[in-house]
Amino acid sequence: LPAQVAFTPYAPEPGSTCRLREYYDQTAQMCCSKCSPGQHAKVFCTKTSDTVCDSCEDSTYTQLWNWVPECLSCGSRCSSDQVETQACTREQNRICTCRPGWYCALSKQEGCRLCAPLRKCRPGFGVARPGTETSDVVCKPCAPGTFSNTTSSTDICRPHQICNVVAIPGNASMDAVCTSTSPTRSMAPGAVHLPQPVSTRSQHTQPTPEPSTAPSTSFLLPMGPSPPAEGSTGD
């Protein structure tokens, strides 16, 4: 004959554990039912009666099978630099993530505690590493033969256009200006494949960035309470 199924509450056999979705109540010394996600234990079990569960109230939740006396409070509303990617329900906490153009500077178990704006590389500097959900943009100075004329958290250094006749040589923050009606090769931002900067470097007279744009090592420091780093802007 199959073993008789025990209904909660029941005393476990010596050395055995309670079944899935049950817990051992130390006071009653019985295996008792857990409450399902979205509920909490309103009345704990006794030797003769099982756990009494009740639904979580508004703005509270339980995500797991549990026997907690009170549901957990949902986190506070998302701040203005965040978006709510998961709403507060009886079964899950609110999750706030950083809105586009921001990254998570201080994460928590789920979502983000503190968002910070992505660093923007100023003209003469391009993005060396794009920002991610959890890391800031890294800027680098534009190498000879390349330029960036924008203040942007996404723009890379682009090669100067090649001119038949150069009116104004390009520098780190400005494209070359051609005298002829059209350049030999235009490096429009919309071009699908940009040639390697190295392939154009020997064709440009521009030396290393002028002293006014050459970075100090401070451009490498992450932005924080200190002033914006050289090569980046907090705007």
């Epitope: 794009p130 190498a143 890379i156 699908v192 494949h193 970075p215 451009f219 490498l220």
Partner: antibody, heavy 118, light 107 residues
């Protein structure tokens, strides 16, 4: 957790072709810059090339040693990076690593071995 | 192309030692330098970027310094797990280039 898994390596004769794939997960692939770095047996690291993201119009860059023979592409809908290698030479023999996140590399795949030999 | 030259090519040291590895670029790379550690049969691991920024999860005994063309990686007190090969890499300009590597061995 960021994961990069390369596949497609193997033995190929000089002049032959091979296509490597890199399946990415654990991060927003479409925003990431992806690249390939190789390492010949018992040698140092050599950058092969990279492809940047859509916001930069997917520019590609290559090492001089592979330019014209290798092509990097990506399929953001499949979270996959590709390296098409044509006109292979014996000196292309190496472990090829898929990398991310920029002009320096936070994450690396385990690598796939490409052997070019007659 | 920007050439990266590392020295020494190999180095013997003991646990607890302070070790310095240098990397010289053929032209100014404006601190656009990364350092990697690679153990035999393993994948390279990023240690530092921007010459002196410690990557997430890297122990503070690793530090970087330098500017212009000359850069150093310092390990303040060698641990057994630090014996490996170290590479520098410039990302100022394409093509991105690596140093030839420095093998750090147990004395």
């Amino acid at each position: 957790e960021v994961q990069l898994v390369e596949s497609g390596g193997g033995l190929v004769k000089p002049g032959g072709s091979l296509r490597l794939s890199c399946a990415a997960s654990g991060f927003t692939f479409s925003n990431a810059w992806m690249g390939w770095v190789r390492q010949a047996p018992e040698k140092g690291l050599e950058w092969v090339g990279q492809i940047k993201d859509k916001s930069n119009n997917y520019p590609t860059y290559y090492a001089e040693s592979v330019k014209g023979r290798f092509t990097i592409s990506r399929d953001d809908s499949k979270n996959t990076l590709y390296l098409q290698m044509n006109s292979l030479k014996t000196e292309d023999t190496a472990v090829y690593y898929c990398t991310t996140y920029g002009d320096f590399f936070d994450y690396w795949g385990q690598g796939t071995l490409v052997t070019v030999s007659s | 192309d920007i050439q990266m030259t590392q020295s020494p090519s190999s180095l013997s040291a003991s646990v607890g030692d302070r070790v310095t590895i240098t990397c010289r670029a053929s032209e100014d790379i404006y601190n656009a330098l990364a350092w990697y550690q690679q153990k035999p049969g393993k994948v390279p691991k990023l240690l530092l970027y921007n010459a002196n920024s410690l990557h997430t999860g890297v122990p503070s005994r690793f530090s970087g310094s330098g500017s212009g063309t000359d850069y150093t990686l310092t390990i303040s007190s060698l641990q057994p797990e630090d014996f490996a090969t170290y590479f520098c890499q410039q990302y100022y300009d394409h093509p991105l280039t690596f140093g030839q590597g420095t093998k750090l061995e147990i004395k």
